[in-house]
C-alpha cells in the first residue's frame, strides 16, 4: 500500500523517514509558548546530528502588521500578537560553517545546511508519531526555470566546479572583506496576490505562516553576506489583484513598482517589496532590478510561486531581492560559492549559497553609496522583532541596541545591558547624531544629487535625516530639454555618457527608428511573452537607447554586447547586457525621458506626459523663488522662506528641515 | 480661447458603463491636445486619458482597459468611454483642451466639470 505522505514526496527523487528527538525531559510537549532555544536528534543518511536552534528574534515585529482587503476593497490593517513565534535559526554541532532555518509549529520544518549538502525536512503527513521527511536539496524536481539569457559559459563553470574542491563562503568572504563586516538590515516587505491566497485555500493565518517562514529562510541564507533580513510587512489581496498581472514578467514588474510607489510607501516604510504570485511567465521564475534597493520607484520584484516548496521558492526569491541588491547573474564570471551552482545563477537552481561574485557585486553598491537605506537599524516601530536587548536592533522600548557585550565596549553612546542611551546622551545613531548629540539644526544630512533633487537637513531635535524628497516629477530640466523624473533629469545625452562616457551623446532619430523597429534584443520596445517587440515609429525612442560620438567601451563587472548599426553618415551604437530576462534591461532609454513635445517614456511608450501629473505653478505657489517637491510644497531658493517663498529667509522647505542654525547661520553653506 | 462643456455624467453601479461628452466650441479644436482630468473628494485633480493631434492615446495607470478616449474633429468634440467602473472611479471629471506639448496641469482651459457617483 501507498505510504502516507505518498503525494508528499512526488518531487523528491529520494528521501529518507525519520523521528527526531527532542533533548529534554519531556519528549516532544513543547510548553507554549514556544521555547527560546531548544535542541533535537536527527538523523541524516545513516548519521545522527544534534541540532541547537535558537528562535529567531531579529526576523519579526511587536507589532507585526498583515494588510487585507473585506469584500467592498477596504484595506484592513491587523496587528496579530506572534511575539512567541516558532521559528528558528540554528547550526548543527560538531559542524563547521553549518547554519538552520527551522519552523518548530507544528513538527520541524525547515532547511539545514552543512558543508557540503543542503537538506530540507518536513513532518509527514498523517503521522501520529512525529515522523518526518528529510531529503537532500539536490534531489527535489524542478521545472526547468529561467532568470536569464542561456550563456555557453554555465557548462564550463559547472565542469570545473566538479573537479576542483572550492573554498568554502567564509573563506571566500575573509578574503574581500572591505565593506561586508558592517551589518546590513534589509527592511522587506512581502504581497501576495489573490491567485496564490485562492491557491492556499484562502486562509490568512496559512498564508501569513508560511511568509514568515520565508523571511526566516531568506534571513539564513543572507546572513553569510552580514546582511539580516527583517520582514517589515505583509499585504494580502484577498480580494483581487491591484495591479493588472497580464502580459509579460515586465509589465508585471512595472505595475507592481508603480502600484508600490503610490500605496505602498506612504503606508509602511521598507526597503524592497516582493510580489508573491501564482501566474507563471513562460518558465520565468521573477524578474526584479538591479541595484535598485533604496529606490523610491524601482525597489521591487515579482516572484513565481506555483507548484513548488516553499524551501525551493525561497531561492527564488533570495535571487530577486539580490538583483534589488545590486547583484547580477553569476553565468560567465569566475564564482564560486561552495556549491554546484548558487543563488545568482540564471537558472533557478535551488542553491542556498550566495558567491564571491554577489559579495562583490554587493560591496560594490554599498561602496558607491546604493545601499545606504540598509544601514539603518529599524525603528521600534517599524521592525518586526520580540524586543530583546543585544541583537542590534532598536526594539521597542529601547533608545539604542549597540549589540554584544564585547560590541558595546566600543559604543560610547549607548549602556549595553539595557539598552538605554547613557546619562550624557542625546542619540547613539542616525545621520544626524554625532559624538552622542544631536546635530545641530541646518546641518546638511542628505546633499543635492542632481539638478533634480533637493537637499535635506538634520532639524536639530531627532538623530534622523528628514526623508527624503527631491523636485516634482514633471518638472522642467536640462533648460527646457527634459524632465525631472524621480530626483534625476532624464536625457538620452546623460544615459549615453553613463554607458559610452563623457563625450557620448544620443544619435539621431533615424538611428532609434532603424534600430528599434527590428524587434531584437539590440533594438526593440520590450518584451512580450518570450519574444522581443519591434517600436511603432512613434514609439522608437523610448526603445533601445542608440548612442554616437563613442570613444569608451563599457565595463560594469559585466561584459556587455556592443552593437554598431550605420545610419545616415553615422554610427549608432547600442548596448545589450545580457542580464537575462529576469532584470530590466539598463541599456534601454530610462523611463521619464522626454521623447516628444510634451510626452515622456513610460513602459516602452512615447506618451502624454500629463500622466506625471505636474500640476505647479511656480510663480502663483512659491511666488517665483522655488520649485515643487515630490510632496507638493515649495523648496524656496535661498534667500526665501518657506512655505510660500513670499517672505525673506534661508531657502529650503517644510519638508527639508532647517537649512539654517540660529546659532551659527555659516552652517548655511 | 476653447469653451468646453462635460456631459454623460451620472450615478451607476459598480461594474456598470457611462459615456462622457465634451464639446468644445472655438476655432481651434483640431491642434489641441484633449484630455479627461478627475479630482475626487479631498483628493488632488489627477490625469485620467488624452488624445494628442498626432494620434497618440495615454491613459492613467488605473484606468487602463477599461476607458477609451476618442475625438471626432468634425463635431469638436472628445468622448470618454468608462467600463467596469469601480467606486474609486467617483469624481467629478473635468475636460481640459490644450496646445500640444503643454502638459502641466494650469495649462489650457477647462470646462466646468461632471459628476460620476459609482456605488457599491
Known amino acids: 500500500a501507498a505510504r502516507p505522505g505518498f503525494q508528499q514526496t512526488s518531487h523528491l527523487s529520494s528521501y529518507e523517514i525519520i523521528t527526531p528527538w527532542r533533548l529534554t525531559r519531556e519528549r516532544r510537549e513543547a510548553p507554549r509558548p514556544y521555547s527560546k532555544q531548544v535542541s533535537y536528534v536527527i538523523q541524516a543518511e545513516g548519521k545522527e546530528h544534534i541540532i541547537h536552534l535558537e528562535r529567531n528574534k531579529d526576523l519579526l515585529p511587536e507589532d507585526f502588521v498583515v494588510y487585507t482587503y473585506n469584500k467592498e476593497g477596504t484595506l484592513i490593517t491587523d496587528h496579530p500578537n506572534i511575539q512567541n513565534h516558532c521559528h528558528y535559526r540554528g547550526y548543527v554541532e560538531g559542524v563547521h560553517n553549518s547554519s538552520i532555518a527551522l519552523s518548530d509549529c507544528f513538527g520541524l520544518r525547515g532547511l539545514l545546511h552543512l558543508e557540503n549538502a543542503s537538506y530540507g525536512i518536513e513532518p509527514l503527513q498523517n503521522s501520529s508519531h512525529f515522523e518526518h521527511i528529510i531529503y537532500r536539496m539536490d534531489d527535489v524536481y524542478k521545472e526547468p526555470l529561467k532568470c536569464g539569457v542561456s550563456n555557453k559559459d554555465i557548462e564550463k563553470e559547472t565542469a570545473k566546479d566538479e573537479e576542483e574542491e572550492p573554498p568554502s563562503m567564509t573563506q571566500l568572504l575573509r578574503r574581500r572583506r572591505a565593506v561586508l563586516p558592517q551589518t546590513r538590515y534589509v527592511e522587506l516587505f512581502i504581497v501576495v496576490d489573490k491567485e496564490r491566497y485562492d491557491m492556499m485555500g484562502r486562509n490568512q493565518t496559512a498564508v501569513r505562516e508560511e511568509m514568515i517562514l520565508l523571511a526566516n529562510y531568506l534571513d539564513s541564507m543572507y546572513i553569510m553576506l552580514n546582511i539580516r533580513i527583517v520582514l517589515v510587512g505583509l499585504e494580502i489581496w484577498t480580494n483581487g489583484n491591484l495591479i493588472n498581472i497580464v502580459g509579460g514578467a515586465g509589465d508585471v514588474l512595472g505595475n507592481f513598482v508603480q502600484w508600490r510607489e503610490k500605496f505602498l510607501i506612504t503606508r509602511r516604510r521598507h526597503d524592497s517589496a516582493q510580489l508573491v504570485l501564482k501566474k507563471g511567465f513562460g518558465g520565468t521564475a521573477g524578474m526584479a532590478f538591479v541595484g535598485t534597493v533604496c529606490s523610491r520607484s524601482h525597489a521591487g520584484g515579482i516572484n513565481v510561486f506555483g507548484q513548488i516548496t516553499v524551501e525551493t521558492f525561497a531561492s527564488i526569491v533570495a535571487h530577486e531581492l539580490g538583483h534589488n541588491l545590486g547583484m547580477n547573474h553569476d553565468d560567465g564570471r569566475d564564482c564560486s560559492c561552495g556549491a554546484k551552482s548558487c543563488i545568482m545563477n540564471s537558472g533557478a537552481s535551488g542553491s542556498r549559497n550566495f558567491s564571491s561574485c554577489s559579495a562583490e557585486d554587493f560591496e560594490k553598491l554599498t561602496l558607491n553609496k546604493g545601499g545606504n537605506c540598509l544601514l539603518n537599524i529599524p525603528k521600534p516601530d517599524e521592525a518586526y522583532s520580540a524586543p530583546s536587548c543585544g541583537n542590534k536592533l532598536v526594539d521597542a522600548g529601547e533608545e539604542c541596541d549597540c549589540g554584544t557585550p564585547k560590541e558595546c565596549e566600543l559604543d560610547p553612546c549607548c549602556e549595553g545591558s539595557t539598552c538605554k542611551l547613557k546619562s550624557f546622551a542625546e542619540c547613539a545613531y542616525g545621520d544626524c547624531c554625532k559624538d552622542c548629540r544631536f546635530l545641530p539644526g541646518g546641518t546638511l544630512c542628505r546633499g543635492k544629487t542632481s539638478e533634480c533633487d533637493v537637499p535635506e537637513y538634520c532639524n536639530g531635535s531627532s538623530q534622523f535625516c528628514q526623508p527624503d524628497v527631491f523636485i516634482q516629477n514633471g518638472y522642467p530640466c536640462q533648460n527646457n530639454k527634459a524632465y525631472c523624473y524621480n530626483g534625476m533629469c532624464q536625457y538620452y545625452d546623460a544615459q549615453c555618457q553613463v554607458i559610452f562616457g563623457s563625450k557620448a551623446k544620443a544619435a539621431p532619430k533615424d538611428c532609434f527608428i532603424e534600430v528599434n523597429s527590428k524587434g531584437d534584443r539590440f533594438g526593440n520596445c520590450g518584451f512580450s511573452g518570450n519574444e522581443y517587440k519591434k517600436c511603432a515609429t512613434g514609439n522608437a525612442l523610448c526603445g533601445k537607447l542608440q548612442c554616437e560620438n563613442v570613444q569608451e567601451i563599457p565595463v560594469f563587472g559585466i561584459v556587455p554586447a556592443i552593437i554598431q548599426t550605420p545610419s545616415r553618415g553615422t554610427k549608432c551604437w547600442g548596448v545589450d547586457f545580457q542580464l537575462g530576462s529576469d532584470v530590466p534591461d539598463p541599456g534601454m532609454v530610462n523611463e521619464g525621458t522626454k521623447c516628444g513635445a510634451g510626452k515622456i517614456c513610460r513602459n516602452f511608450q512615447c506618451v502624454d506626459a500629463s500622466v506625471l501629473n505636474y500640476d505647479c505653478d511656480v510663480q502663483k505657489k512659491c511666488h517665483g523663488h522655488g520649485v515643487c517637491n515630490s510632496n507638493k510644497n515649495c523648496h524656496c531658493e535661498n534667500g526665501w522662506a518657506p512655505p510660500n517663498c513670499e517672505t525673506k529667509g534661508y531657502g529650503g522647505s517644510v519638508d527639508s528641515g532647517p537649512t539654517y542654525n540660529e546659532m551659527n547661520t555659516a552652517l548655511r553653506d | 480661447e476653447v469653451q468646453l462643456v462635460e456631459s454623460g455624467g451620472g450615478l451607476v453601479q459598480a461594474g456598470g458603463s457611462l459615456r462622457l461628452s465634451c464639446a468644445a466650441s472655438g476655432s481651434i479644436f483640431s491642434s489641441n491636445t484633449m484630455a479627461w482630468y478627475r479630482q475626487a473628494p479631498r483628493k488632488q485633480r489627477e490625469f485620467v486619458a488624452s488624445?494628442?493631434?498626432?494620434?497618440?492615446?495615454t491613459y492613467a495607470d488605473s484606468v487602463k482597459g477599461r476607458f477609451a478616449i476618442s475625438r471626432d474633429t468634425a463635431k469638436n468634440t472628445v468622448a470618454l468611454q468608462m467600463n467596469s467602473l469601480k467606486p474609486e472611479d467617483t469624481a467629478v471629471y473635468y475636460c481640459?483642451?490644450?496646445?500640444?506639448?503643454?502638459?502641466?496641469?494650469?495649462?489650457?482651459?477647462w470646462g466646468q466639470g461632471t459628476q460620476v457617483t459609482v456605488s457599491s
Open positions: 488624445i494628442m493631434t498626432d494620434g497618440t492615446i
Open positions: 481640459n483642451a490644450r496646445q500640444y506639448g503643454e502638459y502641466w496641469q494650469a495649462a489650457g482651459s
